[in-house]
């Protein structure tokens, strides 16, 4: 995520006694929460690395920039950065790698420019369907974000909830219509085995969309039709074996897209014949050359753009005498 | 069935190019990954990078970039790598592979002494 | 760059005896694993690819597993032409990279 940076001697440190002093009250204009370092002029907090179990709650309300990541602190609560007066200028927050296990309904509220928010490496087992868009109304009033970046947020397999993964993320991600205009959703390293099939069709905003390293076989019931703005899909290093023609032209018919193939088992059989032709054809699959046949084991390495039909083909099927168990 | 057969050995001076080759038969050579690898005593084995013959792309690990350079020669279905301004950290045995998710089949590979 | 560390660099053995060779990634690789062996000659063969698939040709003496950033390839039943070195070799992510090699020999 883009945010300015600026050189250690701009950021000032605040005294320890200072938080536990003043936190009941209205933050001081150019007050700096103990553990963190604040720099009016690049309008940035930083408490890094710092073991926070709660979000600090003097905040300066100059903050533009919050960088809150390497913390410990489990659960967000509902309207854990609401502030009298409130972080209007709030617009770039980053939760990463704090141990966050649980997100509340209404964790963001009061947040009126929040356009980056970023909660990767979080183990999530418990995001909440309202986390995003504050209210359980089935039309919630518009988010702000832009940039939603939910990376490696899948928790161990002993940790999550007795239900899908993948639903509760796409839950919190259409909760009320809020994130309409999100441009960039990356959900990058999260085991997910499928793409739940509404979920792109009410994100018609986006421009970048990043499913890469997940476990992802097929895309025969996703749609790409709505989203006439997307300009990147990452699915390298997912469990991908063909592309059937659905899919294929949907993605061409995308008027800005470039897509990210590589690290799948592409499997070389009769049913890649289709891919194939439009590879050879398409301008819009990023290093397509170095798309290579995982199996069958006769087809290994093989580079997808060299095949033609008469190597793409399937054992034929015997009739059940014939078929040994 | 498939073979690579590589250049003989080279005995070059520091500062010299060296251009090895690798002759590939028994398969479409068009239609795989050449890699080349480097293997220097107590070094074990780098990648260089790679070319597909056919198209003449080519990927090259970083650390090989400028050293090596990679051209394919498809009417005779032979893979090159030229190595320029050889010092003696370039003496190895370099081998070509057929690849690119495996490297099923190894030439024999060439020695590249560099001296004085 | 994924480091692949092989953290026994020789080991002895007694013709029958199963080996066990051991190959860590500093990242998690998804099973893009290989193994190769070299023969004293410099002849290089792949063994396994993906972890545990046996590459054609291969004796089912030879075997992977592994997964995320440990890997292992054994031998069930050592057989004097398994003297050599191996290595695994990494294919998650550009530059593929090698582990440093275990050097087999009898006892």
């Known amino acids: 995520s883009s945010s300015p940076t600026s050189s250690a001697s701009s950021f000032s440190s605040s005294a320890p006694f200072l938080a536990s002093a003043v936190s009941a009250q209205p933050p001081l204009p150019d007050q700096c929460p103990a553990l963190c370092e604040c720099s009016e002029a690049a309008r940035t907090v930083k408490c890094v690395n710092r073991n926070l179990t709660e979000v600090p709650t003097d905040l300066p309300a100059y903050v533009r920039n919050l960088f809150l990541t390497g913390n410990q602190l489990a659960v967000l609560p509902a309207g854990a950065f609401a502030r009298r007066p409130p972080l209007a200028e709030l617009a770039a927050l980053n939760l990463s790698g704090s141990r966050l296990d649980e997100v509340r309904a209404g964790a963001f509220e009061h947040l009126p420019s929040l356009r980056q928010l970023d909660l990767s490496h979080n183990p999530l087992a418990d995001l909440s369907p309202f986390a995003f868009s504050g209210s359980n109304a089935s039309v919630s009033a518009p988010s702000p974000l832009v940039e939603l970046i939910l990376n490696h947020i899948v928790p161990p397999e002993d940790e999550r909830q007795n239900r899908s993964f993948e639903g509760m993320v796409v839950a919190a991600l259409l909760a009320g219509r809020a994130l309409q205009g999100l441009r960039r959703l990356e959900l990058a390293s999260n085991h997910f085995l499928y793409l739940p099939r509404d979920v792109l069709a009410q994100l018609p905003s986006l421009r970048h969309l990043d499913l890469s390293n997940n476990s992802l076989v097929s895309l025969t019931y996703v749609s790409f039709r709505n989203l006439t703005h997307l300009e990147s899909l990452h699915l390298e290093d997912n469990a991908l074996k063909v592309l059937h023609n659905g899919t294929l032209a949907e993605l061409q018919g995308l008027p800005h897209i470039r897509v990210f193939l590589d690290n799948n088992p592409w499997v070389c059989d009769c049913h890649m014949a289709d891919m194939v032709t439009w590879l050879k054809e398409t301008e819009v699959v990023q290093g397509k050359d170095r798309l290579t046949c995982a199996y069958p084991e006769k087809m290994r390495n093989r580079v997808l753009l060299e095949l033609n039909s008469a190597d793409l083909d399937c054992d034929p099927i015997l009739p059940p005498s014939l078929q040994t168990s | 069935q498939v073979q690579l057969q590589q250049s003989g050995a080279e005995l070059m001076k520091p500062g010299a190019s060296v251009k090895l080759s690798c002759k590939a038969t028994g398969y479409t050579f068009t239609g795989y990954w050449i890699e080349w690898i480097k293997q220097r005593p107590g070094h074990g084995l780098e990648w260089i990078g790679e070319?597909?013959?056919?198209?003449?792309?080519?990927d090259y690990n970083e650390k090989f970039k400028g050293k090596a350079t990679f051209t394919a020669d498809t009417s005779s279905n032979t893979a090159y790598m030229q190595l320029s301004s050889l010092t003696t950290e370039d003496s190895a045995i370099y081998y070509c592979?057929?690849?690119?998710?495996?490297?099923?089949?190894w030439g024999q590979g060439t020695l590249v002494t560099v001296s004085a | 760059d994924i480091q692949m560390t092989q953290t026994t660099s020789s080991l002895s053995a007694s013709l029958g005896d199963r080996v066990t060779i051991s190959c860590s990634a500093s990242?998690?690789?998804?099973?893009?694993l290989n193994w190769y062996q070299q023969k004293p000659d410099g002849t290089v063969k792949l063994l396994i690819y993906?972890?545990?698939s046996l590459h054609s040709g291969v004796p089912s003496r030879f075997s992977g597993s592994g997964s995320g950033t440990d890997y292992s390839l054994t031998i069930s039943n050592l057989e004097p032409e398994d003297i050599a070195t191996y290595y695994c070799?990494?294919?998650?992510?550009?530059?593929?990279?090698f582990g440093g090699g275990t050097k087999l020999e009898i006892k």
């Open positions: 990242q998690g690789i998804r099973n893009y």
């Open positions: 070799q990494q294919y998650s992510k550009v530059p593929w990279t």
């Open positions: 592979t057929r690849g690119r998710l495996d490297f099923t089949y």
């Open positions: 070319i597909l013959p056919g198209r003449g792309s080519t």
């Open positions: 993906y972890t545990s």
